[in-house]
Amino acid sequence: MAKAAAIGIDLGTTYSCVGVFQHGKVEIIANDQGNRTTPSYVAFTDTERLIGDAAKNQVALNPQNTVFDAKRLIGRKFGDPVVQSDMKHWPFQVINDGDKPKVQVSYKGETKAFYPEEISSMVLTKMKEIAEAYLGYPVTNAVITVPAYFNDSQRQATKDAGVIAGLNVLRIINEPTAAAIAYGLDRTGKGERNVLIFDLGGGTFDVSILTIDDGIFEVKATAGDTHLGGEDFDNRLVNHFVEEFKRKHKKDISQNKRAVRRLRTACERAKRTLSSSTQASLEIDSLFEGIDFYTSITRARFEELCSDLFRSTLEPVEKALRDAKLDKAQIHDLVLVGGSTRIPKVQKLLQDFFNGRDLNKSINPDEAVAYGAAVQAAILMGDKSENVQDLLLLDVAPLSLGLETAGGVMTALIKRNSTIPTKQTQIFTTYSDNQPGVLIQVYEGERAMTKDNNLLGRFELSGIPPAPRGVPQIEVTFDIDANGILNVTATDKSTGKANKITITNDKGRLSKEEIERMVQEAEKYKAEDEVQRERVSAKNALESYAFNMKSAVEDEGLKGKISEADKKKVLDKCQEVISWLDANTLAEKDEFEHKRKELEQVCNPIISGLYQGAGGPGPGGFGAQGPKGGSGSGPTIEEVD
């Protein structure tokens, strides 16, 4: 009989995750609710003990007896300033037992007190049970992860929690180390590598810098904010909508716990939606005093609401670099961990800080730590099946996969060397007013322009209702399964109408040799590709800005707010630029940028005058960062920033 598998557990502050390595690959295991992460919550009621989703779902009804954040207590003394500070924010009671903190709750009519290790052991028991339900046999061996900054006391307490849960803890490993293992960064064979792990979770933010040399991991520096995470972003949304509800309905819902809880759940859902779409809707029936609350929020507004929080994530990055005595150019790999790193703005800030460096994000960010822990568990169990050492070099997409957007640009949804299976979704839009359909052309390759890449297939999504350019939202999903079969789906979000294509390995795909040749060619052409990409990007930015400005001043809502002279000035300049663009599609980047700056010089003072004090966009609020445009024949699809 085959040896029982060992599991990897990411014991998180707000959510936990479990994975197992079997049949040559890691499987992240879903719980009985179908969720691949489980809330690190334990609730005590008059009749039962609840763990995970069930516990979190009833938190608003039973706050004093629902325990979370045990990770903030584990291995700490009661007098620890962290404990004293955190206690002020918890609805449950923390008591002092010989300078050890204990959580006091009412359970089955009695007062009970539990050590943090006991609470964590309950969460670990749940994770163990999730794995056992999936594997069909008892599990005892596990690798459990902890933050890199955890001291010996915190590590030992976590190990004790594992033992209490009936686990044989093979090893306690650092969360950033696990994430690096997940990406195979310990097996690149390229000598010493500096890896920065950016872990933005539900309630905590950790930055770690590791040096990996010949499979040896050394933590060089850690930094972060123990109270920054997805929940803070949810709070910003909740506050925003509480204020919106006040404005619309002249009622304050903030003191109604049930209404706020329902709003928070909707906000969390909206936040997740905004990572893949540029707009999210909230529909809450009878939110307060019988009033239905139907509203929406754009990604741009969400980014604005959280801008200071997002920007603040770079301070610990800088601190970690200083502490590690490294320059940002010396970081070889950037790894994203934690669900909040799905937020495009967070990714952009980090990528821009590192001057455009690629981010390792192909593994689900809230699963990366458990993934690495599962790999480590398999290694420690001496698993040689499918050669666990080479596991991570096997299942990758050998070339970037994407589609053609306006101007013949290759827009990659799945980057080369992404671990598969993987699924990526992006929102696109139309290029022309009243465009009835879009042509989805799927390519693989590393070149900037699709004409230099390999066409895998094409299909059309028709029946798009008439709308101005840039308004329709076409959701395109690239989904590669474990066998390398690619499914591309396009859905018009307004109608739900969809079309898809399936591309298998043997249909129009490239051989190993061709892939190798294309990779080498791509290196050779990188410089000229970059020039071309920048040129098209500058052209698209100019075109977008011109059309945005034109439609902005033509907006009926601005009647009486803008003088005819100013309106004419903007429209004349837009006309000049748009006509110039039509005649100069092959102009240089400098020329496009010059025209954009010229147009901004005319428009920005006029537009900003309209929005000063109006809560709308500030100077250049309709900015050059609008939908990217381009030229091309046929129904063109356009990327949405």
Partner: antibody
Amino acid sequence: QIQLVQSGAEVKKPGASVKVSCKASGYTFTNYGMNWVRQAPGQGLEWMGWINTYTGEPTYADDFKGRFTFTTDTSTSTAYMELRSLRSDDTAVYFCARYDHVMDYWGQGTLVTVSS
Amino acid sequence: EIVLTQSPDSLAVSLGERATINCKSSQSLLNSGTRKNYLAWYQQKAGQSPKLLIYWTSTRESGVPDRFSGSGSGTDFTLTIDSLQAEDVAVYYCKQSYTLYTFGGGTKVEIK
């Protein structure tokens, strides 16, 4: 009335830097771009580039990329042109010129002499 | 980049006579949407800053005497001074703003 007043003549040694200022008055500074034009002794006009006074984004002509920097201080309605690593062939009169759709108002020019 | 070639380099004309200056562009300066040619003319007197005379090929800047006129389209443009006056002695430059900006080499106008 609209005026662009430039800083006085400068004499510099090769390798040094110079910063020419151009103070605008009589109009809203951030509503119009500011161009810089060079005229070497006995030569024609050369467009160096311009700065978007609203966003602060500069544009440099090909021959003026690298050692030249355009900046603005909107609080004083002043545009600046800095030139580093001066060479003898940088000796010229430097003009600032307001730009709407044409260069309609010009500064009086600043003579920069580079001599060892 | 667009190159503007002015001719002649210098020109001596009697007072009251007509002076004609040409400016040839390496590419068309006509924007078909606005139907404008993005060419301007500047006058620079000795020791002074340049002064705008004409923009969009033929539109006179306010305060410029009507003896100055501009014409042309596409790549060929002309500045005409109908009846030369003593105060018209200067160097005249054409400038394009179709894409980025460039000046012509200048034409020196003197009294014969």
